[in-house]
Interface confidence: low
Amino acid sequence: DSSKWVFEHPETLYAWEGACVWIPCTYRALDGDLESFILFHNPEYNKNTSKFDGTRLYESTKDGKVPSEQKRVQFLGDKNKNCTLSIHPVHLNDSGQLGLRMESKTEKWMERIHLNVSERPFPPHIQLPPEIQESQEVTLTCLLNFSCYGYPIQLQWLLEGVPMRQAAVTSTSLTIKSVFTRSELKFSPQWSHHGKIVTCQLQDADGKFLSNDTVQLNVKHTPKLEIKVTPSDAIVREGDSVTMTCEVSSSNPEYTTVSWLKDGTSLKKQNTFTLNLREVTKDQSGKYCCQVSNDVGPGRSEEVFLQVQYAPEPSTVQILHSPAVEGSQVEFLCMSLANPLPTNYTWYHNGKEMQGRTEEKVHIPKILPWHAGTYSCVAENILGTGQRGPGAELDVQYPPKKVTTVIQNPMPIREGDTVTLSCNYNSSNPSVTRYEWKPHGAWEEPSLGVLKIQNVGWDNTTIACAACNSWCSWASPVALNVQYAPRDVRVRKIKPLSEIHSGNSVSLQCDFSSSHPKEVQFFWEKNGRLLGKESQLNFDSISPEDAGSYSCWVNNSIGQTASKAWTLEVLYAPRRLRVSMSPGDQVMEGKSATLTCESDANPPVSHYTWFDWNNQSLPYHSQKLRLEPVKVQHSGAYWCQGTNSVGKGRSPLSTLTVYYSPETIGRR
């Protein structure tokens, strides 16, 4: 049943003498494995023998016999699926029909494949897109119906016989559907490629030429133009004539229209290849080009810049920057339309020519107030001198100048006075808008630039003001020189350094912290009595009677100031001791008698000692000696001794008389 055999392979294979043929082939024998395979060249069926006659190129049988031809022809298939064949090398006489005789256990089949072997390598075929336009990428394809594993080939692209720089992509196909080698080249043709020859060259593995195909490029492009101008530099003066000529160097297809453009705008009624401009004016300066169109589109020439020369126009001045700050830099630019550009400039400041300034720009590195004013300029080129324009105003701004603080009061100023100061300045730009004062205080500013200090303090030494516009300028501080009575008057003991003892030399100093004016007088006072008029009060030998409350006064022309009262304390040993008796120096026995040791001492007596008429000390140490009851034997002379931290003092003797009572007299 022949329907059981299914084959797939290319219908015809192409090769050339000495190359090789690779025949991709698959089959399916549904009733079992292949048992016998014979490759015939131009097989003919013999009805008599019921067998095929023809040249046997390959034979694979059960007994394994292989003809000598098998070295050239190889069956690369298997027993159930693959029937791929290779003939290497292939010869011209291999052209014709190849017959694959297949036999399985029960079935037979003859499959025919066409083989076309040429004497020489056949050329590849170049495929081009239907239309090629400049700068549009196209793909050029070179196709060759050949590929064989045993015979490597390459396809190379040439432009006018020179290898093309663009990288080509080569692909091969060796499948049951098709056998080919293909090279694809992406290429952006330019107008200059029009008419050029492109070649696809077939080469062997060593780069040896085998065959080729050529095509001529038909690149559609806009007209390519050249513009020529008389005079050639396109520089003329007003009133001259200019001729421009447009030449078409290439156009595909042929051009249809011509026009001229100035600054991108079409010139009316100018549709020939020559543009004549007679008696040109400066307004005709500009970029000229010609435009020629074809079916692809318009082409433009390079632009010619026509320069119509003229004398400078009235100039204007541009200032960078106004207003300018004093000390900053300023640049002036003289602007004047002229062709050619001006070569010389004359500058004016407030109508007066500025010497040595001949450039387009004037640079002043450090602006001063006197630079303010109107700046104008005149431009000059080879055709003449322009007119001076209106000029530009430079405003120079600066902080207030020569600021001074002025005291309005009559001098001298006394503590407690109301002081008025004004802040004055010489000049300012912009105007002064505010004032500042140092130091800050709760002071009045009755009007701009005036300061009123009520009840001025003795310590208000200096005041400074600043006049402010955009900046503040400070005046030098002004001294108020406030006059005041002496301050902080106090009594200070100079000597001795320790406490004052009776008999010491003592010096007291009248101190004060400050006085304005400095000339002063001193007064010492004790208990309202004037003691001296020096800064010091001296005691050669102090006595307890000098103790008391002292004050000093310091006078200047403004007033006088007293110190706080200062207490002078004199330390001395007990003195003026005496023994007093109570109720008297005659006491009746049995009564009570009290002896008191009286003294004058500073500090007070801290310790008392009592003595009798025998200078015998008694065991009593308090100020009072109490005898109760008093006896006649107590009669006699007594004295006491007082002690303090300074020393000791003793009293004179005092006699106590104790007389008998009536009872005692009565008993006798």
Partner: nanobody
Framework: QVQLVESGGGLVQPGGSLRLSCAAS???????MGWFRQAPGKEREFVAG????????YYADSVKGRFTISGDNAKNTTYLQMNSLKPEDTAVYYC??????????????????WGQGTQVTVSS
């Protein structure tokens, strides 16, 4: 007075895009406009140029395929579209104009007018 004013610069991450514009003010003429750049401590180098007559463009090898120069001759404006930006593109970008035809478009000395420059920083 001719003035060229650039805009569009700024900070962008690597791989990002920016579009620079350059507007020419005043009544004047030009043959071509170009973009140059100057990185810190390096010389000013050509980036791209455009010839108005046929919109022909020119590029430095380092920016080919990433930068595109275009323009509007009627408005005297040129644009530089910068894609796939790299840290080495960091520079001050200057716009320049050829008032008269002076030949090669990648030579600084052939340009008559220059802008003040716009900073382009490419950093993550």
């Amino acid at each position: 007075q001719v003035q060229l004013v650039e805009s569009g610069g700024g900070l962008v991450q690597p791989g990002g895009s920016l579009r620079l514009s350059c507007a020419a003010s005043g009544s004047w003429f030009n043959i071509a406009m170009g973009w140059f750049r100057q990185a810190p401590g390096k010389e000013r180098e050509f980036v791209a140029g455009i010839r108005w007559s046929d919109s022909k463009t020119y590029y430095a090898d380092s920016v080919k395929g990433r930068f595109t120069i275009s323009g509007d001759n009627a408005k005297n404006t040129t644009y530089l579209q910068m894609n796939s930006l790299k840290p080495e593109d960091t520079a001050v970008y200057y716009c320049a104009a050829q008032r008269y035809y002076r030949g090669s478009y990648n030579r600084q000395t052939n340009y008559d007018h220059w802008g003040q420059g716009t900073q382009v920083t490419v950093s993550s």
